[in-house]
């Protein structure tokens, strides 16, 4: 496939990745699907520098990222290793809190108003950030 060399319209380029910042809210699974349909994924934060960049663009608003533990272990949606990777949880988080009364614990991670991370009920309609890497082979077949 051809390689993407510049970001799509309305996406922001940063460090060889493209980012799209929603202005509406969706449940985590719907946000995840939205990004996939854009040949992207929910944002995967791999460094303090990337954390600061995303935080600057989203402001003090709860925003989904591509991290969840719905199947047990914490997993980044692109396969980045959680255990060895960057983490920026709020103190006392993640806590898998059951006291919300909505059923289950808290299985999806989001940026909080100060940028640090919290786990929350995946059905909550938060904003989200999509990310796709430049130089990644696109899904379009090559021209013959």
């Amino acid at each position: 496939g051809s390689e993407r060399t510049c970001c799509p319209v309305n996406w922001v380029e940063h460090e060889r990745s493209c980012y799209w910042f929603s202005r509406s809210g969706k449940a985590w699974a719907d946000a995840d699907n939205y990004c996939r349909l854009e040949d992207a994924h929910l944002v995967v934060v791999t460094s303090w520098e990337e954390q600061k960049f995303v935080q600057h663009h989203i402001g003090p608003v709860n925003t989904w990222m591509g991290l969840h533990d719905q199947n047990g272990p914490w997993k980044w949606v692109d396969g980045t290793d959680y255990e060895t990777g960057f983490k920026n949880w709020r103190p006392e988080q993640p806590d898998d809190w059951y006291g919300h009364g909505l059923g289950g614990g808290e299985d999806c991670a989001h940026f909080t108003d100060d940028g640090r991370w919290n786990d929350d009920v995946c059905q909550r309609p938060y904003r989200w950030v999509c990310e796709t890497e430049l130089d990644k082979a696109s899904q379009e077949p090559p021209l013959l």
Partner: antibody
Framework: EVQLLESGGGLVQPGGSLRLSCAAS????????MSWVRQAPGKGLEWVSA????????YYADSVKGRFTISRDNSENTLYLQMSSLRAEDTAVYYC????????WGQGTLVTVSS | DIQMTQSPSSLSASVGDRVTITCRAS??????LAWFQQKPGKAPKSLIS???SLQSGVPSKFSGSGSGTDFTLTISSLQPEDFATYYC?????????FGPGTKVDIK
């Protein structure tokens, strides 16, 4: 590789106390809730207690409430179960398990309550 | 507390058989259901979480389905190593509760 290793089991008299430990390795311990589950000889599984990743929330089965205390030391990657006022019906293999869905288990430690 | 029931309590099957175990919750638990396999003298092993998500390393002959109150675990082609006791467990709300187990043995 994830490892959970329980210890501290043994023979104790009715009314006595025991503290179980579960040493965890191979994962970010503080990111996961942890549980204790027990299995009496020849019986099924019974969930006993759970604790959130930070230790801020604890939960207990009615059968052990007021007698057992779950805790954790995230600096030492260790989960504990302090058991007091033990009864014959507490005799079981005690397992520690990782995560809300208990997706990884230790090999268990046997607690026998008998005079 | 949420009560979990399983059926059958035991079953005899042959190698190659398709086996289905049913688990029912006394109230709705969405998809907060896990399945475990336990062999004699061994710790339980997680097979499935979130009702249908196979744990890493678990063969695809195991599958789970269901939501709400009714759930199933299916073994598509039973192998000698699959003879064991299977438990379901809800983690929708505390206290977590297990089903009584289904023992699968050789016919």
């Amino acid at each position: 590789e994830v490892q959970l290793l329980e210890s501290g089991g043994g023979l104790v008299q009715p009314g006595g106390s025991l503290r179980l430990s579960c040493a965890a390795s191979g994962f970010t311990f503080s990111s996961y809730a942890m549980s204790w589950v027990r299995q009496a000889p020849g019986k099924g599984l019974e969930w006993v207690s759970a604790i959130s990743g930070s230790g801020g929330y604890t939960y207990y089965a009615d059968s052990v409430k007021g007698r057992f205390t779950i805790s954790r030391d995230n600096s030492e990657n260790t989960l504990y179960l302090q058991m007091s006022s033990l009864r014959a019906e507490d005799t079981a293999v005690y397992y520690c398990a990782k995560g809300g869905s208990l997706f990884y288990w230790g090999q268990g430690t046997l607690v026998t309550v008998s005079s | 507390d949420i009560q979990m029931t399983q059926s059958p309590s035991s079953l005899s099957a042959s190698v190659g058989d398709r086996v289905t175990i049913t688990c029912r919750a006394s109230q709705g638990i969405s998809n907060y259901l896990a399945w475990f396999q336990q062999k004699p003298g061994k710790a339980p092993k997680s097979l499935i979480s979130a009702a249908s998500s196979l744990q890493s390393g678990v063969p695809s002959k195991f599958s789970g389905s269901g939501s709400g109150t009714d759930f199933t675990l299916t073994i598509s082609s039973l192998q000698p190593e699959d003879f064991a006791t299977y438990y379901c467990q809800q983690y929708n709300s505390y206290p977590f509760t297990f089903g009584p187990g289904t023992k699968v043995d050789i016919k």
